[in-house]
Interface confidence: low
């Protein structure tokens, strides 16, 4: 297993609709054709997997359909979007990138993006 640098923004503020987007960029040492991207959430010293996708370079980054994540890839950049976030989801979101093929296998883990989520105030005249 070889180490690889992964860069991601330090802080992102989710939109009022609970959507947060950030770029995860990895320094690919070679021409990878298959890449696995995993988003991990670290909160209260607990790390949980938010979503993951294995994709072939040049093709659409496809998470399973019900994932809260969507994404696109362009070169060595992955544009990740996490949806359905609420205030309780505030935390450090870490981008993990694995170059699966061709060998050698590379692994890179970013420092994390602190995503802040603020639940919007309900409209005064609204019942919901």
């Amino acid at each position: 297993c070889k180490a690889m640098h992964v860069a991601q923004p330090a802080v992102v503020l989710a939109s009022s609709r609970g959507i947060a987007s950030f770029v995860c960029e990895y320094a690919s040492p070679g021409k990878a054709t298959e890449v696995r991207v995993t988003v991990l959430r670290q909160a209260d010293s607990q790390v949980t997997e938010v979503c993951a996708a294995t994709y072939m370079m040049g093709n659409e980054l496809t998470f399973l359909d019900d994932s809260i994540c969507t994404g696109t890839s362009s070169g060595n950049q992955v544009n990740l979007t996490i949806q359905g976030l609420r205030a309780m989801d505030t935390g450090l979101y870490i981008c993990k990138v694995e170059l699966m093929y061709p060998p050698p296998y590379y692994l890179g883990i970013g420092n994390g993006t602190q995503i802040y989520v603020i639940d919007p105030e309900p409209c005064p005249d609204s019942d919901f």
Epitope: T33, E34, M56, G58, N59, D65, D66, Y101
Partner: antibody, heavy 115, light 106 residues
Framework: QVQLVQSGAELKKPGASVKVSCKAS????????INWIRQAPGQGLEWIGR????????YYNEVFKGRATITVDKSTSTAYMELSSLRSEDTAVYFC????????WGQGTLVTVSS | EIVLTQSPATLSLSPGERATMSCSAS?????MHWFQQRPGQSPRRLIY???KLASGVPARFSGSGSGTDYTLTISSLEPEDFATYYC?????????FGQGTKLEIK
Amino acid sequence: QVQLVQSGAELKKPGASVKVSCKASGYTFTSYWINWIRQAPGQGLEWIGRIAPGSGTTYYNEVFKGRATITVDKSTSTAYMELSSLRSEDTAVYFCARGDYGSYWGQGTLVTVSS
Amino acid sequence: EIVLTQSPATLSLSPGERATMSCSASSSISYMHWFQQRPGQSPRRLIYDTSKLASGVPARFSGSGSGTDYTLTISSLEPEDFATYYCHQRTSYPLTFGQGTKLEIK
């Protein structure tokens, strides 16, 4: 043009194994998943599993785990699906399909399990 | 496992008529995909991501739905449309298919 050409029909006895091949051409083999699906006579479609030809990463339907093994030979752009401990209920047409929402399928391989 | 239930099992219509078939999922899914299979042939992709028409598929085919209920519609049936149609989900493993709707000539 893109083609997935499968091996010919097989007649097997219960308890035996069968290995079906799927030779891909017309595209970069390592750029797409290969799925395996089967269809029993007069029945619907059942997903067996899939493989990423580049790394060999596999996902299986739990129903077939332990009995199905999906592999590839990158040098010949061929995917294989081996099913062991065959029983009569495994009599079906076995298809390979390219992974981008199944845009291309093999012609199917009939596997008959009979004593 | 997400179970997909298609209805009706058989649909008897005449050329030129409108065909509508349904697919109900046992759990909510984000997208439905549809395949057509003629006797003795491999399945053919028709619709992906619920409503996107696959390459080479005539515009008379359309898909809709959300959550657990999805529909495939053929606006005006052509003779070559008489076949079996399968819905398919890839929201979660294992990937599953419906049992099929057979569209036959009345």
